[in-house]
Amino acid sequence: MMTGTIETTGNISAKKGGSVILQCHLSSTMAQVTQVNWEQHDHSLLAIRNAELGWHIYPAFKDRVAPGPGLGLTLQSLTMNDTGEYFCTYHTYPDGTYRGRIFLEVLESSVAEHSARFQIP
């Protein structure tokens, strides 16, 4: 039985050209996290974090994606095209798969709303 829940940063906004941290946290389960996958709105893989082996960033995003903090992901040099949904998929044993959703809005304006506590100015 899957008892866990994923907490995410929810809906966040950030400035064009700036950076933002995407964070998910799995709670209420003793399941072992084996891998976390991060995907973009069109289900493009951004990165994989394997519990034993570490991080791999997908080659196409190498210049703009940085691992961490923790199991999170940092998106850099944001463009308007980065607006959309992001998904963290937690592969766990023995529970199975948990999925969290974050919506990122990239703002043109010089002052973006600071709506997320994980955001980098």
């Epitope: 069109d42 289900h43 493009s44 893989l45 394997n50 791999h56 997908y58 080659p59 196409a60 190498k62």
Partner: antibody, heavy 119, light 107 residues
Amino acid sequence: EVKLVESGGALVQPGGSLKLSCAASGFTFSDYYMYWVRQTPEKRLEWVASITKGGGSTYYPDTLKGRFTISRDNAKNTLYLQMSRLKSEDTDMYYCARQSSYDFVMDYWGQGTSVTVSS
Amino acid sequence: DIVMTQSHKFMSTSVGDRVTITCKASQDVDTAVAWYQQKPGQSPKLLIYWASARHTGVPDRFTGSGSGTDFTLTISNVQSEDLADYFCQQYSNYPLTFGVGTKLELK
């Protein structure tokens, strides 16, 4: 059992076009990135193209961009490679491959289909 | 482009031996390296990913190691069915690139 079966390889004249297909079975096709890789007669392997699960993003080496197009039909569990303006150096064995769910590597490959470009 | 150099195109071995195949990347690729085995008339098969993780069903006599620019594939207690071509591949950066291969043959 994961199965990838390529087809469409043929003898084609320089400047011609060809469309390769790869029929996938034994797994949920729409859950995986897919690749085309080619192998020269001297056995050198060269990455040709990659495509995301839904087909929204495609990637190619600069040397092939514009001539080759990767696409997929998830309803038909089929991967395609459209090749145009073919050159003699495109003479190769073409393999389709599936990306692993554990990492960005090709965990299963088809048996290949042979393309010969010659006049 | 990142060049993957397999300096030995051929390596001779005997059944029961231990053999080490090397691969060098022209720049740092962290641990984003895979090893494939290809037997005559067959397609490549994944052996190792993440530089050291064995793919499902791969015998434990195959061991991958390395990070950065230097990588090795070690086959301990070589069996006759291991005689094949071995290719390394980096997937740290586009374009994805492969080594030219090392052919493992009997002495």
